[in-house]
């Protein structure tokens, strides 16, 4: 029939499977007079034949790896043969079978890791070809590990790319392999087509051998250095190395201390530059960081930690110039008078700073001499000899030495005698009464004067008066401040007060003095008065139970996800609504409810991380009282910033013509967030044909060299354009345009004739 | 395979403005250049404007700076043309074209297009 297998001469194209026996014709072309015969020319390799009578066909099996198309042609004859039609292209695709295995390129593999090395950088490729065609199933390679040798714990310490060969070390292997332990891996490694994907398909393996090598950046022990050293500065205190030589050293304070007496060589040889003051500074943490030539960090950083040792360069010192005491006439032997406590700046429980405290004169030397004693360790003063009386001696003045192992230091006391305290202090008011306050009440407001008085002498610890309140106020909402020369009690409110927790309290004040009272006598219920605190009730604002909410959520997550809740409480027990204030992305809505927040729209962690809005919880009913809180949104980083050019590249040139290939390099950035080691970009051209021109290498993760392949530029701009793709995950490729002109130079600058169009570059390469 | 095909030409006075469109079908309009080409009866193509497809970067012939104007919605994978000021010497059959693997850097150079659409024409009377 006209159509599929027969019809007149015109350009066709035939698919036809490979390996396969012919089973049919291919076509048969019909002739118009005055053509009667045809012929068939071209790529036919004895394969393709046609009939005078315009029948096409083959002869024997094809092979898509021998010949992927032939082109015939093929012409229409007279019956003196001269050709009247054509002749017209006819092509034949000949379709891939899976007729081919994979092979490697290498029966043995070798290569070495550095241990500790990143997760996921490969540091090995192996590589295996196949014949068949890579756009088809039948040519796509799928590698796999088969087996690591040793296996500890069932644990794979390296991992393969499926698609690219190339192998990596897994997490677990960057953390665990030490070359101390095991220093050599063994991986078979399989190689398979069809994708992997099907039981049909060939297969191939190989042998690869790891050499693990020692990582030498490890940070080193901690230092312990000696304070005020008097040797010559620097000092070299410690040491790091990075693996190959060529590093950049230098060191990071993450405390951004006034002065940091720290350095580094290009050894890597860490110093210190001045005597140090453990007084000032007892330790240090910085970081020693490992550079390449262009400024990128090489790993992490390494913590360096280094301890000032105590030397005993600080004396004793007093706690002020004159220490005062009182002691009553009539105490008895043994009696504390008081404590002296002296500091001392060196280190805190060693020798350099234990202290010894000793007599060594009391004035007057009245009725005798050596009437107090000190405890030896712990300044405690004491009466030695017997009670004292004031009409006698009304002061004593000791001085005392205080010392540490090497240092003395002389501190006064002023020793009072004073009156017996045999007189209780006696309120001039049991009963205060009622007071009503508002729960509302200012803190700080003093609520109340409660007076009571003392007989024994003025202005000593034996009349000078204490007020507590000993029951009724377990909260300690209340305090008492004693007016020293009069001993009025002002009673203030310290915390607010709560009509929900506490409506009426009943106040009990007890008045004390400082002194001991005599044997004998006793605080009676003189000392003793009440007064009764009725709060009222006032509409209070809801209560946040946090002043801040934080919660984290990645920055892809899906719109009307829960990334986090509120909760307020209102004193009065009504319901209350939640509302967002400052949501000025328009990212997020609460829950009037439950105070649970959602995302509506995409998030965006480059638009700025934490988001921060307010909540506000209201009262529903009576006054609407509300209250505001923080809600902070940190958004986690996923890869979503395809790689771009660092900078604006306009007027970039070369002198034309070229007398030799030249180059340019350009750095690459994106908006995702990159830990110490920074990015790792690779860099492609944009187009298969910009190769015939340029190439482009990687120097390190973020830059890359563009350089001319020949000098035979036109004198024009060229757009080259260049993929940059970043590894995340997923990856992102983005196509950067890098405008390079050849023009004609004056003394290295472009020439521009007078009316030159506009635009013109101005940096040489 | 990247179909192009143009739109919006038409009779416009002096002075006047046209806008065309491309619509890009078979796949995404993901080439790294798109471009808007014109060519008169008996002449070569000659280059009007092209869009560097990351980062937005355009280009203009020198006859057409400051009146046109190319710009695309990825959403719509149609590329436009805006024309203002039209003058009778703009008039000719308005190409669009996208770079594939032949592109070597000249961006103004039609060899260098690999997809080309069926054209528009524009023509403005005076």
């Known amino acids: 029939q006209e159509g599929k297998f027969s019809g007149p001469l015109k350009p066709m194209t035939f698919s036809i499977y490979e390996g396969q026996e012919p089973s049919q014709i291919i076509f048969q072309f019909k002739a118009n007079p005055p053509a009667v015969t045809f012929e068939l020319t071209g790529e036919t390799d004895n394969i393709f034949v046609i009939e005078r009578e315009g029948l096409l066909y083959y002869n024997r099996a094809l092979d898509r790896e021998t010949r992927s198309t032939h082109n015939l042609q093929v012409a229409a004859l007279d019956a003196n043969g001269i050709i009247v039609e054509g002749p017209v292209p006819i092509t034949i695709k000949v379709k891939d079978i899976n007729d081919n295995r994979p092979t490697f390129l290498q029966s043995k593999y070798e290569g070495s890791v550095r241990q500790n090395s990143r997760p996921g950088k490969p540091f090995l490729y192996v590589n295996a070809t196949d014949l068949d065609d890579p756009a088809t199933p039948n040519g796509q390679l799928y590698y796999q590990i088969v087996i690591q040798l040793p296996m500890i714990n069932n644990v794979m310490y390296f991992q393969i790319n499926n698609k690219t060969g190339a192998i990596s070390l897994t997490r677990e292997g960057s953390q665990e392999l030490n070359p101390a332990k095991n220093p050599s891996y063994n991986l078979v490694i399989s190689v398979k087509d069809m994708g992997g994907q099907s039981e049909n398909s060939f297969s191939d393996t190989t042998s690869v051998d790891i050499i693990v090598t020692e990582n030498i950046w490890k940070a080193p022990k901690p230092v312990e250095m000696v304070e005020n050293s008097t040797d010559p500065h620097p000092i070299k205190i410690t040491q790091v190395r990075w693996n190959d030589p060529g590093a950049q050293y230098s060191l990071v304070d993450k405390e951004k201390l006034p002065r940091f007496p720290f350095s580094i060589d290009q050894e890597g040889d860490i110093y210190v530059t001045q005597p140090l003051d453990r007084e000032e500074k007892d330790a240090y943490v910085f970081y020693a960081v490992a550079k390449d030539e262009y400024g990128k960090p090489l790993s992490y950083p390494l913590e360096i930690h280094v301890k000032v040792k105590d030397i005993n360069d600080n004396p004793p010192t007093c706690p002020s110039p004159v220490t005062v005491f009182e002691v009553q006439e009539n105490e008895r032997l043994g009696n504390s008078i008081g404590t002296l406590t002296a500091h001392d700046r060196d280190e805190e429980n060693t020798a350099n700073s234990f202290l010894n405290y000793r007599i060594v004169e009391q004035t007057p030397k009245l009725p005798m001499d050596g009437l107090f004693l000190i405890q030896t360790y712990a300044g405690m003063l004491q009466l030695a000899k017997q009670s004292l009386k004031k009409q006698d001696t009304p002061q004593y003045n000791l001085t005392i030495e205080v010392s540490d192992k090497d240092f003395k230091t002389l501190c006064f006391v002023q020793i009072n005698v004073i009156d017996i305290n045999d007189q209780i202090p006696i309120f001039e008011k049991s009963d205060y009464g009622n007071l009503t306050l508002a729960e509302d009440t200012n803190i700080g407001s003093t609520i109340l004067t409660i007076q009571a008085t003392d007989a024994d002498e003025p202005f000593t610890g034996s009349s000078k008066i204490l007020y507590h309140i000993i029951k009724g106020d377990s909260e300690g909402r209340l305090g008492v401040d004693t007016d020293p020369h009069t001993n009025t009690g002002y009673v203030i409110i310290k915390k607010p007060l709560d009509f929900e927790t506490a409506a009426v309290s009943n106040i009990v004040f007890k008045a004390e003095n400082p002194e001991p009272l005599v044997f004998g006598v006793k605080y009676n219920a003189s000392s003793f008065a009440k007064f009764t605190l009725i709060v009222t009730d006032v509409n209070e604002a809801p209560q946040f139970s946090q002043h801040v909410f934080q919660a984290k959520v990645s920055e892809d997550v899906a719109i009307g996800t829960k990334v986090g809740n509120v909760t307020a409480k209102d004193p009065e027990g009504l319901d209350i609504s939640y509302s967002l204030r400052g949501d000025t992305r328009g990212w997020l809505k609460i829950d009037h409810v439950t105070g649970e927040i959602f995302s509506v729209a995409p998030l965006d962690r480059e638009a700025g991380s934490p988001y921060r809005v307010q909540v506000v919880a209201t009262e529903v009913g009576g006054s609407s009282l509300s209250s505001v809180s923080e809600f902070h949104l940190i958004l986690m980083d996923v890869n979503d910033n395809p790689p771009r050019l660092a900078k604006d590249y306009t007027g970039l040139f070369f002198c034309h013509p070229l007398s030799a290939p030249g180059s340019l390099i350009f750095e690459a950035t994106d908006d995702d967030q990159h830990l110490f080691r920074g990015p790792h970009f690779t860099f492609s051209l944009g187009s298969g044909s910009l190769q015939n021109d340029w190439e482009v290498s990687k120097i390190n993760g973020t830059h890359a060299r563009l350089s001319t392949r020949h000098t035979e530029f036109e004198e024009r701009e060229y757009v080259v354009l260049i993929r940059i793709n970043d590894g995340g995950r997923p990856p992102l490729e983005g196509i950067v345009s890098l405008p390079v002109t050849f023009c004609s130079c004056v003394e290295g600058s472009c020439f521009r004739p007078a009316g030159h169009q506009t635009g013109i570059p101005t940096v040489g390469m | 395979e990247v179909q192009l095909v143009e739109s919006g030409g038409g009779l416009v006075q002096a002075g006047g403005s046209l806008r065309l469109s491309c619509a890009a079908s078979?796949?995404?309009?993901?080439?790294?250049?798109v471009g808007w080409f014109r060519q008169t009866p008996g002449k070569e193509r000659d280059f009007v404007a092209a869009?560097?497809?990351?980062?937005?970067?355009?280009r203009y012939a020198d006859s057409v700076k400051g009146r046109f104007t190319i710009s695309r919605d990825n959403a719509k994978n149609t590329l436009y043309l805006q024309m203002n000021s039209l003058k009778p010497e703009d008039t000719a059959v308005y190409y669009c074209?996208?770079?594939?693997?032949?592109?070597?850097?000249?961006?103004?150079?039609?060899?260098?297009?690999?997809?080309w659409g069926q054209g528009t024409q524009v023509t403005v009377s005076s």
């Open positions: 078979g796949r995404t309009f993901s080439e790294p250049i």
């Open positions: 869009l560097i497809s990351t980062g937005g970067s355009t």
């Open positions: 074209a996208a770079t594939g693997d032949s592109y070597r850097g000249a961006d103004d150079r039609p060899a260098e297009y690999d997809y």
